[in-house]
Interface confidence: low
């Protein structure tokens, strides 16, 4: 298969040989008659680079074509080529290079005695010759021309169209839509890649992450995703992951554990304000934070224990002498003395 960027198309539409004569005014010998001079007509086409003065001689630098016999004297040609499968109308000249925008065209109408002999060069067979040069931009529109000489008319049209997947003024821009690992795009009017929704980059291979996905800490494999890099979390990968076990702390960067006010230690799990949060001291004792989750209680008179939870019994052991009975008072005691004894602890005898 010929690789090409575009194709020059020539559509032969109508040929009129008013008198059925050759270019040298002779009758077409061996013609199809009647009339006696009917010309079996075929065409030779030569497409070449632009020449200010067109030379009909080879080489046909852009290509050449010879048609079968298409009609006798005057005839119209349908699109597609009609009954003869060997001829397709328009005639196509594939290009494997950038279309230059100019060309020269030679179309010769010739007569043949035998439909099997179209190759033999014989100037006496020439009915008419058209030689022209044109500027032509790429496009779908057909340009139409009518070439008239004294006895013949040739109506034809031509255009240059890009092959599928080729774009631009010279059909030199290649763009084939795709939707795979190598690109997710369609093609614009000038062959530019138009990324499918959710994709970006020169080849539309970079997925557009979920809007808001942190550019530094998030990424995605397909559109709308937001996958987090190590140490980050959250829908937009904008939340750092704290040090494992971090309890009352925050982070600005991964694996940090910056303690909130009132907390300390590696995991921010040690209460620096134990007194306020837990009120451990009982019975009106005074609590003092001593750091790292510890504290001390200063007991009021009459109380003891780590949290001043124990009341001191002043009667244990009893200080009362001589069988006196003891009554516990706050931070004190009193002795009830038996008859004959008195004093703070019944230590004195009345005798």
């Amino acid at each position: 298969q010929v690789w090409s960027s575009g194709v020059f198309e020539l559509k032969l539409q109508e040929f009129v040989n008013k008198k059925g004569l050759l270019g040298n005014r002779n009758c077409c010998r061996g013609g199809a008659g009647p009339p006696p001079c009917a010309c079996r007509t075929f065409f030779r086409v030569c497409l070449k680079h632009y020449q200010a003065s067109v030379s009909p001689e080879p080489p046909c630098t852009y290509g050449s074509a010879v048609t079968p016999v298409l009609g006798v004297d005057s005839f119209s040609l349908p699109d597609g080529g009609g009954a003869d499968s060997a001829f397709s109308n328009p005639i196509r000249f594939p290009f494997g290079f950038t279309w230059p925008g100019t060309f020269s065209l030679i179309i010769e109408a010739l007569h043949t005695d035998s439909p099997d002999d179209l190759a033999t060069e014989n100037p006496e067979r020439l009915i008419s010759r058209l030689a022209t040069q044109r500027h032509l931009t790429v496009g779908e529109e057909w340009s139409q021309d009518l070439h008239s000489s004294g006895r013949t008319d040739l109506k034809y049209s031509y255009r240059f169209v890009c092959d599928e997947h080729y774009y631009g003024e010279g059909c030199s821009v290649f763009c084939r839509p795709r939707d795979d690992a190598f690109g997710h795009f369609t093609c614009g009017e000038r062959g530019e890649k138009v990324c499918n929704p959710g994709w970006k980059g020169p080849y539309c291979t970079e997925p557009i992450c979920l809007p808001g996905c942190d550019e530094q800490h998030g990424f995605c494999d397909k559109p709308g995703e937001c996958k987090c890099r190590v140490g980050w979390q959250g829908r937009y990968c904008d939340e750092c992951i704290r040090y494992p076990g971090c309890l009352h702390g925050t982070c600005q960067q991964p694996w940090q554990c910056n303690c909130q006010e009132g907390w300390g230690g590696l995991f921010c799990n040690q209460d620096l304000n134990y007194c306020t949060h837990h009120k451990p001291c009982k019975n009106g004792a005074t609590c003092t934070n001593t750091g790292q989750g510890s504290y001390t209680c200063s007991c009021r008179p009459g109380y003891t224990g780590a949290t001043c939870e124990l009341g001191i019994d002043e009667c244990d052991p009893s200080p009362c002498k001589n069988g006196g009975s003891c009554t516990d008072l706050e931070n004190s005691y009193s002795c009830t003395c038996p008859p004959g004894f008195y004093g703070k602890i019944c230590e004195l005898s009345a005798m």
């Epitope: 929704p197 959710g198 979920l210 809007p211 808001g212 559109p223 709308g224 937009y236 904008d238």
Partner: antibody, heavy 123, light 107 residues
């Protein structure tokens, strides 16, 4: 921890005004849109409007356009819904919710919502 | 405004059932659709965004599909905590609009 807390709801007479607040914490306030969504008793969800705190750009539902105004104070990380000319049909629980920029882009949804505040319009 | 029409409006199902809720947009909304779950007296919770992406922390029994105008929320095996009302929401064109809701009840 991301949090949105609405306040300011209550009972108001038809034609009256009320201002709801939505206090945001735990995220960069200017990196998201804040939307107000309401739900009338026993009914479905209805979008009221939204704001991009970064540039103050707002959009409203046709049903509240001209009566409600959304604003944001980035220094306080708070969005507001000023409701004027209130009608009985405005009675609803009002939620604020956060959403990434350009709600029209990819259908990314409203991922955090406040607890809601009840507005009752009645005489 | 774009209308989002959910069906059915309510359904009864048993634990372990496969449940499918559909949402039809009145015009093409690409894949700009989110699904929410709401329980009585609570705020909605995001389940699915961009039509088919499972939101962080949502159980994998929930899935979403569709693009253009037709969208589906599927619960592969209904759990007791899944009995709630579900809403779809488009955010392709302003204003964002919600479906009317589908209530999933215990059979």
């Amino acid at each position: 921890e991301v949090q949105l807390v609405e306040s300011g709801g209550g009972l108001v007479q038809p034609g009256g005004s009320l201002r709801l607040s939505c206090a945001a914490s735990g995220f960069t306030f200017t990196s998201y849109d804040i939307h107000w969504v309401r739900q009338a008793p026993g009914k479905g969800l209805e979008w009221v409007g939204g704001i991009s705190p970064a540039d103050g750009d707002t959009d409203y539902a046709n049903s509240v356009k001209g009566r409600f105004t959304i604003s944001a104070d980035t220094s306080k990380n708070t969005a507001y819904l000023q409701m004027n000319s209130l009608r009985a049909e405005d009675t609803a629980v009002y939620y604020c919710a956060r959403n990434d920029y350009d709600v029209r882009f990819v259908g990314s949804g409203m991922d955090y919502w406040g607890q809601g505040t009840l507005v009752t319009v009645s005489s | 405004d774009i209308q989002m029409t959910q069906s059915p409006s309510s359904l009864s199902a048993s634990v372990g059932d496969r449940v499918t809720i559909t949402c039809r947009a009145s015009q093409d909304v690409s894949t700009a659709v989110a699904w929410y779950q709401q329980k009585p007296g609570k705020a909605p919770k995001l389940l699915i965004y961009s039509a088919s992406f499972l939101y962080s922390g949502v159980p994998s029994r929930f899935s979403g599909s569709g693009s253009g105008t037709d969208f589906t929320l599927t619960i592969s095996s209904l759990q007791p905590e899944d009995f709630a009302t579900y809403y779809c929401q488009q955010s392709f064109t302003a204003p964002p609009t919600f479906g009317q809701g589908t209530k999933v009840e215990i059979k």
